[in-house]
């Protein structure tokens, strides 16, 4: 080994990664909100829709104060990976009725993938547990009908919207603890 020499700073650090994750989450939230509104315009929803395969909402108003960095990042990553799988499934199996939303769904998927990479980098830099907790992966079969795929899209976008809304709040709170 040679004599001690300083290294130049790399282009980001954990706090910058967290800032970047917040910006990406906000941007994804705006995209999701816009796409959900488009869905409601084109295919009005008759009440709330749900899908058994979607993750349950990780946070509530009461739990925000007790959030811990590892738990939030791990859970957020697991949930977003699930939503990514569902968006991919929608694009693949959504049928002709959802084909008109293909460009928006494609952009949404790309943004989700980017946010997941940023979260992974943040977790790596902090040396937090990387392995996602084992969760049963519910196989996603083809929708029963055209209306089934529309209901699924409403459920996926609605759930993703709620998840991202809490993610922004949670990540902003975590910023103060890093």
């Amino acid at each position: 080994p040679g004599p001690p020499a300083g290294s130049p700073r790399v282009s980001s650090d954990p706090r910058a990664d967290l800032d970047s994750a917040v910006l990406l989450t906000r941007s994804l939230l705006a995209d999701t909100r816009q796409l959900a509104a488009q869905m409601r315009d084109k295919f009005p929803a008759d009440g709330d829709h749900s899908l058994d395969s979607l993750p349950t909402l990780a946070m509530s108003a009461g739990t925000l104060g007790s959030l811990q960095l590892p738990g939030v990042l791990t859970r957020l990553r697991v949930d977003l990976m699930s939503y990514l799988r569902h968006v991919q499934w929608l694009r693949r199996a959504g049928g002709p009725s959802l084909k008109t939303l293909e460009p928006e769904l494609g952009a949404l998927q790309a943004r989700l993938e980017r946010l997941l990479r940023r979260l992974q980098l943040l977790m790596s830099r902090l040396a937090l547990p990387q392995a996602a907790p084992d969760q049963p992966v519910i196989p996603l079969g083809p929708p029963a009908s055209a209306w089934g795929s529309i209901r699924a899209a409403h459920a996926i976008l609605g759930g993703l919207h709620l998840t991202l809304d809490w993610a922004v709040r949670g990540l902003l709170l975590l910023k103060t603890r890093l």
Partner: antibody
Framework: EVQLLESGGGLVQPGGSLRLSCAAS????????MHWVRQAPGKGLEWVSV????????YYADSVKGRFTISRDNSKNTLYLQMNSLRAEDTAVYYC???????WGQGTLVTVSS | QSVLTQPPSASGTPGQRVTISCTGS?????????VHWYQQLPGTAPKLLIY???ERPSGVPDRFSGSKSGTSASLAISGLRSEDEADYYC???????????FGGGTKLTVL
């Protein structure tokens, strides 16, 4: 400018112990997970251990599990590696590194020999 | 035997483009984990070259680029220079080992 400076290496007999230190400066040490990586003479890099930014998570390579202990003192910006029951195959240059190995120290040589 | 497999050596002439591969498995690269690349010049400590598959730290020339697909990744160096002669390592998290793993390293020779 970021600096990581390892110390504590040297010659030790098989079965002996050493404690390596890594003093950090020029970046927010308490925001980074920290690693120890070693490189035997003429060989490739081998990851040894990692500790999370706040010290709550620690992981070890199978080859050192139960013999080496990683720790950190964020108030002193210092990372440690306590090495016990040393073997000849632990002979290597030991580097400390931050984050996704964003920054590396220059290394300290540990020689285990009788 | 490294968990991530790299060719032991690679070579090229100045100005040429060379590619170094890094092959993993379903517990590391294939599990979706990012790949990072490091350069180790003779007699010095390694240095971060590419992180998160294709991102360059400040100060790293754009001649260096990374990509990832499936269970493998690659590092490309274009406009090869004599100062690029070094050992190159890839790394990724591995679920089965619960820690990061390095490739065996590739010695790049500029002819």
């Amino acid at each position: 400018e970021v600096q990581l400076l390892e110390s504590g290496g040297g010659l030790v007999q098989p079965g002996g112990s050493l404690r390596l230190s890594c003093a950090a400066s020029g970046f927010t040490f308490s925001s980074y997970g920290m690693h120890w990586v070693r490189q035997a003479p003429g060989k490739g890099l081998e990851w040894v251990s990692v500790i999370s930014y706040d010290g709550s998570y620690k992981y070890y390579a199978d080859s050192v599990k139960g013999r080496f202990t990683i720790s950190r003192d964020n108030s002193k910006n210092t990372l440690y590696l306590q090495m016990n029951s040393l073997r000849a195959e632990d002979t290597a240059v030991y580097y400390c590194a931050a984050g996704v190995f964003d920054y590396w120290g220059q290394g300290t040589l540990v020689t285990v020999s009788s | 035997q490294s968990v991530l497999t790299q060719p032991p050596s690679a070579s090229g002439t100045p100005g040429q483009r060379v590619t170094i591969s890094c092959t993993g498995s379903s517990s590391n690269i294939g599990a979706g984990y990012d790949v990072h690349w490091y350069q180790q010049l003779p007699g010095t400590a390694p240095k971060l070259l590419i992180y998160s598959n294709n991102e360059r730290p400040s100060g790293v020339p754009d001649r260096f680029s990374g990509s990832k697909s499936g269970t493998s990744a690659s590092l490309a160096i274009s406009g090869l220079r004599s100062e690029d002669e070094a050992d190159y390592y890839c790394a990724a998290w591995d679920d089965s080992l619960n820690g990061p793993v390095f490739g065996g390293g590739t010695k790049l020779t500029v002819l």
